[in-house]
Interface confidence: medium
């Protein structure tokens, strides 16, 4: 069976004009998934991103996340790329800043 992920992008305020953008994928199966941030269509280097592991969400499906830190005002240049079971999509940063606990 294949259950496509639900993808959600959020922003959190951090200091000095930077924000942390987090892309969360949830409720997907099977477990193998691509999730990465892209700037102007190009994947960011590995060491500028932080990933959570792919973990069960309690419903027989899985969840994970990827986060990166960007300059506030440049949100429109960044997209979260998702690939799962042959399907793929890009998800933009909304620009709406939420006050969330950072992963960093």
């Amino acid at each position: 069976r294949t259950v496509p992920p639900m993808v959600n992008v959020t922003c959190s305020e951090v200091s000095e004009g930077n924000i942390t953008v987090t892309c969360r994928a949830s409720s997907f199966y099977p477990r193998n998934i691509t999730l990465t941030w892209r700037q102007d269509g190009v994947s960011l280097s590995h060491n500028t991103q932080q990933w959570g592991d792919v973990l069960p969400d309690g419903n027989g499906t899985y969840q994970t996340w990827v986060a990166t830190r960007i300059r506030q005002g440049e949100e429109q240049r960044f997209t979260c790329y998702m690939e799962h079971s042959g399907n793929h999509g890009t998800h933009p940063v909304s620009g709406k800043v939420l006050v969330l606990q950072s992963h960093w």
Epitope: L35, T36, S43, H46, D53, V66, E83
Partner: antibody, heavy 119, light 108 residues
């Protein structure tokens, strides 16, 4: 720095079981999964299975009936046990860290445990 | 399972030469999940190129990778002595995850 150090027997009798311990340092088993891969002259590199951070396991169907992978997060140890070994199980067994990120490549390898199945 | 066929099995090259080895998959593999490893005799494999074209840390820029679908390649633009090794392609696209049989790159 990231290290995976393996210990285990070099010689196993046919039909007996193999146990290898992989002790990791420089990272936590609560944040990285670990694969087991073996290498033999006849079959090359073969993926055996892996254990995720939450302790769940994925196995190569060819080995699922005689392979188990476990871990002890507090001791930073991962364990491989394979039953009913035969001569064609001879090879080098590696524990390997599952890289994070969009590629999930095997980014750090242990030094390998050379296993000979022979009477 | 996905079979990865590497060719040639042995590749002899002169120092300074440009060389390319290929990896052909029996069914389509996402470029995100196609990786290359380098192994020298007596040592463990090392991650060399990940996701088709990204060089792992410390890998010289003379290495490059490319491809999509069922056809992938690794190229050395300017062969050096330290590049002599066996290179394996690997797919993490579908379980069981598989490796190619390797291309041994040697100095002519």
């Amino acid at each position: 720095q990231v290290q995976l150090k393996q210990s285990g027997p070099g010689l196993v009798q046919p039909s007996q079981s193999l146990s290898i311990t992989c002790i990791v340092s420089g990272f936590s088993l609560t944040t990285y999964g670990v694969h087991w891969v073996r290498q033999s002259p006849g079959k090359g590199l073969e993926w055996l299975g892996m254990i995720w951070t939450d302790g769940t396991t994925d196995y190569n169907a060819a080995f699922i009936s005689r392979l188990s992978i476990n871990k002890d997060n507090s001791k930073s140890q991962v364990f491989l046990k394979m039953n009913s070994l035969q001569a064609d199980d001879t090879g080098i067994y590696y524990c390997v860290r599952k890289g994070h990120g969009y590629y999930y490549a095997m980014d750090y390898w242990g030094q390998g445990t050379s296993v000979t199945v022979s009477s | 399972q996905i079979l990865l066929t590497q060719s040639p099995a042995i590749l002899s090259a002169s120092l300074g030469e440009r060389v390319t080895m290929t990896c052909t998959a029996s069914s389509s593999v996402s470029s995100s999940y196609l990786h290359w490893y380098q192994q020298k005799p007596g040592s463990s494999p090392k991650l060399w190129i990940y996701s088709t074209s990204n060089l792992a840390s410390g890998v010289p820029a003379r290495f490059s990778g490319g491809g999509s679908g069922t056809s992938y390649s690794l190229t050395v633009s300017n062969m050096e002595a330290e590049d002599a090794a066996t290179y394996y392609c690997h797919q993490y696209h579908r379980s069981p995850f598989t490796f190619g049989s390797g291309t041994k790159l040697e100095i002519k």
